[in-house]
């Protein structure tokens, strides 16, 4: 149904920046406005099928929410309509447009760029750094400290409370308690254990409305096992001659891990020894002042063709060893390619 005679329509549009990342528009509407968000590709190029989401959850059309491929309308906006709206490509889930929407008490002037302090508005809570509210899953090893934060504002200043799996969460609910730092909008749990797994929701509210954010915590159990290496790391790399390259290796281990980076080499034309063990040279290993974090990265500077080949991240602890490998391909510099092309050489892929 179209907006009634008393309702003002306030439009906000963002251009889809093609292959560039989407920009988060921070916009304000007045209570009772019809919110209209538009997401248009440059030059009218088709975006393909899209879906609209609010705070990460898909929006379903209703008598009040009108969902179109490149346009979203919310009739008679209320404080509950505040949040982060995104238009995404239905198949790839690539974010095409991003809006952080606040709904204030007064009808909107239609101009959110006057540079005035936002807290002067009387209104429902809103995230003060909405772009930071998208890290929803946290996986940490047992015994680590976990901190969830939900910085928000509103007028009057909103209160913050926490739920675990939908129920009120208080210090007595866990051994070791929790630290609630209301001014920092944070919940801190020290020395987490598997029973701390679950969904943690911050609820920020004042008399004009409430917003919430849910984080999922997974606690990786400490059990005696060899190091676990993150899948997909290190990743294969292709580099131009003379450029810099980094290989990354994420290691999870309860017992103190020993990390080494190896490069596979040939000895007398053979890659493996008589016993089948590959020939390798150690490029990086623990030293007196090296941290595990530093060992998780192998940096190669000013690469040459000799640097091409197979690299292995090897991690061991008292229980055993794990390793992942990746390949480096080194391509000639562009000028070199052009010179050889002019000389009539042919390169086969």
């Amino acid at each position: 149904e179209p907006p009634g005679p008393e309702q003002r329509v306030v439009r906000r549009a963002a251009e889809v920046p093609g292959p560039e990342p989407s920009q988060q528009e921070q916009v304000a509407f007045g209570s009772g406005d019809t919110v209209e968000l538009s997401c248009h590709p440059p030059g009218g190029a088709p975006t393909g099928p899209t879906v609209w989401a609010k705070d990460g959850t898909g929006l379903v059309a209703s008598h009040r929410i009108l969902v179109g491929p490149q346009r979203l309308q919310v009739l008679n906006a209320s404080h509950e309509d505040a949040g982060v709206y995104s238009c995404q490509h239905r198949l790839t889930r690539r974010v095409l447009c991003h809006f952080s929407v606040r709904v204030t008490d007064a009808p909107s002037s239609g101009d959110d760029e006057d540079g005035e302090d936002v807290a002067e508005d009387t209104g429902a809570p809103y995230w003060t750094r909405p772009e930071r509210m998208d890290k929803k899953l946290l996986a940490v090893p047992a015994a680590n400290t976990v901190r969830f934060r939900c910085p928000a504002a509103g007028n009057p200043t909103p209160s913050i409370s926490w739920l675990k799996n939908g129920k009120e969460f208080r210090g007595e609910h866990r051994i070791g308690g929790i630290k609630l730092r209301h001014q920092q909008w944070s919940l801190v749990m020290e020395s987490v254990v598997p029973s701390d797994r679950g969904n943690y929701t911050c609820v920020v509210e004042n008399k004009f409305g409430s917003i919430r954010q849910t984080y999922t915590l997974d606690v990786l159990e400490r059990s005696p096992h060899r190091p676990i290496l993150q899948a997909g790391l290190p990743a294969n790399q292709t580099a131009i001659l003379g450029s810099d390259v980094e290989f990354h290796c994420k290691v999870y281990s309860d017992a103190q891990p020993h990390i080494q980076w190896l490069k596979h080499v040939e000895v007398n034309g053979s890659k493996v020894g008589p016993d089948g063990t590959p020939y390798v040279t150690v490029l990086k290993t623990a030293g007196a002042n090296t941290t595990d974090k530093e060992l998780e990265v192998l940096s190669l500077h000013n690469v040459t063709f000799e640097d091409a080949g197979e690299y292995t991240c090897l991690a061991g602890n008292s229980i055993g060893f794990s390793h992942h490998s990746a390949w480096l391909v080194v391509l000639p510099a562009e000028e070199e390619l052009m010179e050889t092309d002019e000389a009539g050489s042919v390169y086969a892929g």
Epitope: E20, P21, S22, Q23, Q24, Q26, V95, H98, D117, V118, A119, E120, T128, R129, P130, E131, R132, D134, K135, R149, P151, A153, T157, Q183, Q184, W185, H248, K250, K293, E294, E296, V297, S299
Partner: antibody
Framework: EVQLQQSGPDLVKPGASVKISCKAS????????MNWVKQSHGKSLEWIGD????????TYNQKFKDKATLTVDKSSSTAYMELRSLTSEDSAVYYC???????????WGQGTTLTVSS | DIVMTQSHKFMSTSVGDRVSITCKAS??????VAWYQQKPGQSPQLLIY???TRHTGVPDRFTGSGSGTDYILTIRSVQAEDLALYYC?????????FGAGTKLELK
């Protein structure tokens, strides 16, 4: 060791565009947001905007919305800032700085000096 | 935008002194304040975030305090290497904003 290595100084003519790079090393680039900051000669610091390297989502200071475009190339762990329609007012030192969630800029690049002059 | 005001452009001190640099926000920033040190020709360095949390490796003579709109960076016993520019920043709400800076110099 965490390092943010920025591209070298640049002298450009008014009206032109420039692209400054910031190569991150010593950490996993997708674990931190990348911010960009302007410091005009003898002046304070101005936040230009930030980018989430995971999904490329950017947030800009309105003042720089039509001036700067932030991008990131995950494969090379490099963040970029393009500045367009340059004037003498854009002459400054530009820094990239990483931030974990909400906790301040813990590592900064060495700065890139941009001079706009005809 | 939130305006961060550092009322003293310069502060004179002697080695061994205790000095307090102040910063006032134009609205409540809920302890979302960071402090940076910048020496000539160098990039800023993070000292304190969330008003009072010391960044890794920062000497314990640097402490931060405050809430609401008023924040203080205290250097307990100034060393020669502490003579520098100090900026406050609110990292609570976008757009993030910095103070104009306070230069700490020798008397």
């Amino acid at each position: 060791e965490v390092q943010l290595q920025q591209s070298g100084p640049d002298l450009v003519k008014p009206g032109a565009s420039v692209k400054i790079s910031c190569k991150a090393s010593g950490y996993t680039v997708t674990d931190y947001y990348m911010n960009w900051v302007k410091q005009s000669h003898g002046k304070s610091l101005e936040w230009i905007g930030d980018i989430n390297p995971n999904n490329g989502v950017t947030t800009y200071n309105q003042k720089f919305k039509d001036k700067a475009t932030l991008t990131v190339d995950k494969s090379s762990s490099t963040a970029y800032m393009e500045l367009r329609s340059l004037t003498s007012e854009d002459s400054a030192v530009y820094y990239c700085a990483r931030e974990e969630d909400f906790d301040g800029f813990d590592y900064w690049g060495q700065g890139t000096t941009l001079t706009v002059s005809s | 935008d939130i305006v961060m005001t550092q009322s003293h452009k310069f502060m004179s001190t002697s080695v061994g002194d205790r000095v307090s640099i102040t910063c006032k926000a134009s609205q409540d920033v809920s302890t979302g304040v960071a402090w940076y040190q910048q020496k000539p020709g160098q990039s800023p360095q993070l000292l304190i975030y969330w008003a009072s949390t010391r960044h890794t490796g920062v000497p314990d003579r640097f402490t931060g305090s405050g809430s609401g709109t008023d924040y203080i960076l205290t250097i307990r016993s100034v060393q020669a290497e502490d003579l520098a520019l100090y900026y406050c920043q609110q990292h609570y709400s976008t757009p993030l904003t910095f103070g104009a800076g306070t230069k700490l110099e020798l008397k």
